[in-house]
């Protein structure tokens, strides 16, 4: 006899969330002894049955899955890990980071963390969802559509891997989904922007138009800005992002969203890898999470903060980067952009800690869900007390006291915000003035974490 399940939809829960969670927890604990199945945090590996959809080296791609049979929410997470864009740097990547190019040595299970956790304490947003982690083994920012052949030493099938995972998941319960959230961090975040509309289109074509497809792009909203110091395009890290992607698209046979592609001339598809250019062309709702001072952005801009005091030119460059990024998010209604120097957030265990204007990321995502749930109502005004556009306006790294802890690169000691800013070469007078404060007052506030 099939086990009866009661799908719970928490989007409608309002009022005292803490009290509600406490009740759910107490209910879960009281039911736990009745369960023959131990609570298991692990996601289990499934290699694709269609073995022609492969990682770079021709080994089958795959996904890790943890089902939640009572839920009609599915979270598909795209892993990040840079990219390679020519034979030389792909060979080198294969010899030093093979798990990002092959499934041969993947572990049988993975633990879900952050937004992939099934623990309500760690994941107050979507702990009850079906969790899917898709390992990144195509090195193409999830955009490639070319297989390994006599001519091509490596396959680049990122876009096809996503399509195939979705196809196989339909047979594992995705067909009954209400919401599919395609999420990803870093290159996976960019992968979300490149693939979310295609996934929605795929499900429509396969006869599942009722599944609402949404995107959550973490740390994948890059700028094609001028590098702090220009360097030749030699390796993945120092190559300017525009040039790396330009070369990559050709090498990977990269595909970009159709509506974006039509906005640019042939050969200019690289533009669609940059969030602020592709976002306006997307049909699916996308929530953008981006640190204003993203470490990967700084790396490709040839900014390397290694503990030496920062010169004024570099300090101004970093401040301007934050300003530019903030400007690109102006018309992104669902966004969370703290003024921190960091990279990636959503699968960190402490992803709940950072706040913008007093709102945490899980709370903002909950508000986003509600706004989409209510969007059939004509009103476009944001829900009262439930903000979704959360972009820090203070102008320097770590001016938000809830930023992840910074450590001195060389002593390993934790630094408070004041120490960090002074270490960055910020003149406290300059920083305090726009706030209408004396430097001593500001230092006091920052040291107290206010």
């Amino acid at each position: 006899q099939p086990v009866e399940s009661f799908p719970l939809d928490f989007t409608a829960v309002e009022g005292n969330m803490d009290s509600f969670m406490a009740q759910v927890k107490s209910l879960a604990q009281s039911l736990y002894p009745c369960s023959a199945q131990q609570l298991n945090e692990d996601l289990r590996l499934h290699l694709l049955l269609n073995t022609s959809v492969t990682c770079n080296d021709g080994s089958p791609a795959g996904y890790y899955l943890k089902e939640s049979r009572g839920s009609r929410r599915w979270l598909l997470f795209l892993e990040g890990g840079w990219y390679c864009f020519n034979r030389e740097n792909c060979d080198s990547r294969y010899d030093t980071m093979r798990r990002l190019m092959s499934s041969r040595d993947w572990p049988r299970t993975r633990t879900g963390t952050g937004i992939l956790s099934s623990q309500p304490e760690e994941n107050p947003y979507w702990w009850n969802a079906n969790m899917v982690f898709i390992p990144y083994c195509s090195s193409d920012v999830w955009s490639g559509a070319s297989s390994k052949s006599e001519k091509n030493e490596y396959a680049f099938m990122g876009a096809l891997i996503i399509q195939e995972v979705v196809r196989e998941l339909l047979g594992r319960g995705l067909s009954g989904a209400k919401v599919l959230l395609l999420a990803g961090s870093s290159a996976g975040g960019t992968g979300v922007l490149l693939n979310v509309d295609r996934v929605a289109e795929q499900l429509e074509k396969l006869g599942y138009p009722a599944i609402q497809v949404r995107g959550l792009a973490d740390s994948g909203w890059f700028l094609d800005n001028k590098q702090y110091r220009h360097t030749d395009c030699v390796d993945t890290i120092t190559c300017a992002p525009t040039e790396a992607i330009r070369r990559g698209i050709r090498y990977w046979n990269g595909v970009v969203p159709e509506r974006c592609r039509r906005q640019f001339q042939e050969g200019e598809e690289w533009n669609c890898f940059f969030g602020y250019k592709v976002y306006p062309t997307l049909r699916c709702p996308v929530f953008v999470v981006q640190w204003l001072f993203d470490e990967a952005q700084l790396t490709v801009d040839n900014v390397h903060l290694t503990g030496q005091p920062v010169q004024e030119g570099l300090r101004l460059y970093i401040q301007n980067l934050g300003r530019e990024l903030r400007h690109t998010l102006k018309d992104v209604p669902a966004s969370f952009a703290p003024a921190c120097l960091s990279h990636e957030i959503i699968i960190r265990s402490h992803w709940t800690d950072v706040q913008v204007k007093g709102t945490s990321l899980p709370r903002a995502l909950h508000c986003w869900d509600r706004s989409l749930h209510d969007s059939h109502k004509a009103s476009k005004t944001p829900l009262k007390g439930c903000p979704v556009h959360l972009v820090d306006s203070c102008p320097w790294p770590h001016c938000n006291p809830s930023c992840p802890t910074v450590r001195d690169q060389f002593t390993g000691q934790e630094m408070n915000v004041a120490q960090f800013l002074m270490h960055m070469g910020f003149d406290m007078q300059t920083v305090a003035q726009p706030q209408g404060l004396e430097p001593s007052e500001l230092l006091g506030m920052l040291s107290n974490g206010s």
């Epitope: 990040g80 890990g81 840079w82 034979r87 030389e88 060979d91 080198s92 294969y94 010899d95 030093t96 980071m97 093979r98 798990r99 990002l100 040595d105 030493e153 870093s186 390796d235 993945t236 890290i237 470490e295 790396t299 390397h304 290694t306």
Partner: antibody, heavy 119, light 111 residues
Framework: DVQLLESGGGLVQPGGSRKLSCAAS????????MHWVRQAPEKGLEWVAY????????YYADTVKGRLTLSRDNSKNTLFLEMTSLRSEDTAMYYC????????????WGQGTSLTVSS | DIVLTQSPASLAVSLGQRATISCRAS??????????IHWYQQKPGQPPKLLIY???DLESGVPARFSGSGSGAAFTLNIHPVEEEDAATYYC?????????FGSGTKLEIK
């Protein structure tokens, strides 16, 4: 047992040439990137060159670029380093090392072969 | 190229005490949750031996008194408690990108 055995060192005149070899055993040679690292007498380790697992990519340190040619024969499990226009500063112990493919660290080293460039 | 600065150049530590060696990179060698810094021990007349890989993972067969830490551009090798047989030269090495480089080495002497 994983083993690397270098050979081909010896005394060479400045301007001369030499070919060093590294014979590998106990593992699937074609699965690993291979490197040469050298150490001048009483000095530190200096990375010299890399050959990708398939042999399609080679990369050299600036100090040796243009004078060294790295190659490998995966069917014979052997790595080669051909050195030309040798200088006295090339005098060193030459080690061949296997790079782990989950991090690029050198998890296996040969005993080294000594090259002396002197007139 | 990434330059690795190792310090101190040499140190003398009493038996049973702690030895700490630092390695600083000219730019970050961490990416995708991994730090591409490794530590080797070399004794006279012998090839180097891998101790720690990816900043903090202990190579099998290496005693637990060896430990590595750090991320970004700053890394540390700790030996505690130091034993007689630990007298050697220690090198850090990065494999973040080509060309790979080594630190200049730290000679450890046991008092």
């Amino acid at each position: 047992d994983v083993q690397l055995l270098e050979s081909g060192g010896g005394l060479v005149q400045p301007g001369g040439s030499r070919k060093l070899s590294c014979a590998a055993s106990g593992f699937t040679f074609s699965d690993f990137g291979m490197h040469w690292v050298r150490q001048a007498p009483e000095k530190g380790l200096e990375w010299v060159a890399y050959s990708s697992s398939g042999g399609t990519t080679v990369y050299y340190a600036d100090t040796v670029k243009g004078r060294l040619t790295l190659s490998r024969d995966n069917s014979k499990n052997t790595l080669f380093l051909e050195m030309t226009s040798l200088r006295s500063e090339d005098t060193a112990m030459y080690y061949c090392a296997r790079a782990s493919y989950d991090g690029g660290y050198f998890d296996c080293w040969g005993q080294g072969t000594s090259l002396t460039v002197s007139s | 190229d990434i330059v690795l600065t190792q310090s101190p150049a040499s140190l003398a530590v009493s038996l049973g005490q702690r030895a700490t060696i630092s390695c600083r990179a000219s730019k970050s060698v961490s990416t995708s949750g991994y730090s591409y810094i490794h530590w080797y021990q070399q004794k006279p007349g012998q090839p180097p031996k891998l101790l720690i890989y990816l900043a903090s993972d202990l190579e099998s067969g290496v005693p637990a008194r060896f430990s590595g830490s750090g991320s970004g551009a700053a890394f540390t090798l700790n030996i505690h408690p130091v034993e007689e047989e630990d007298a050697a030269t220690y090198y850090c090495h990065h494999s973040r990108e080509l060309p790979f480089t080594f630190g200049s080495g730290t000679k450890l002497e046991i008092k």
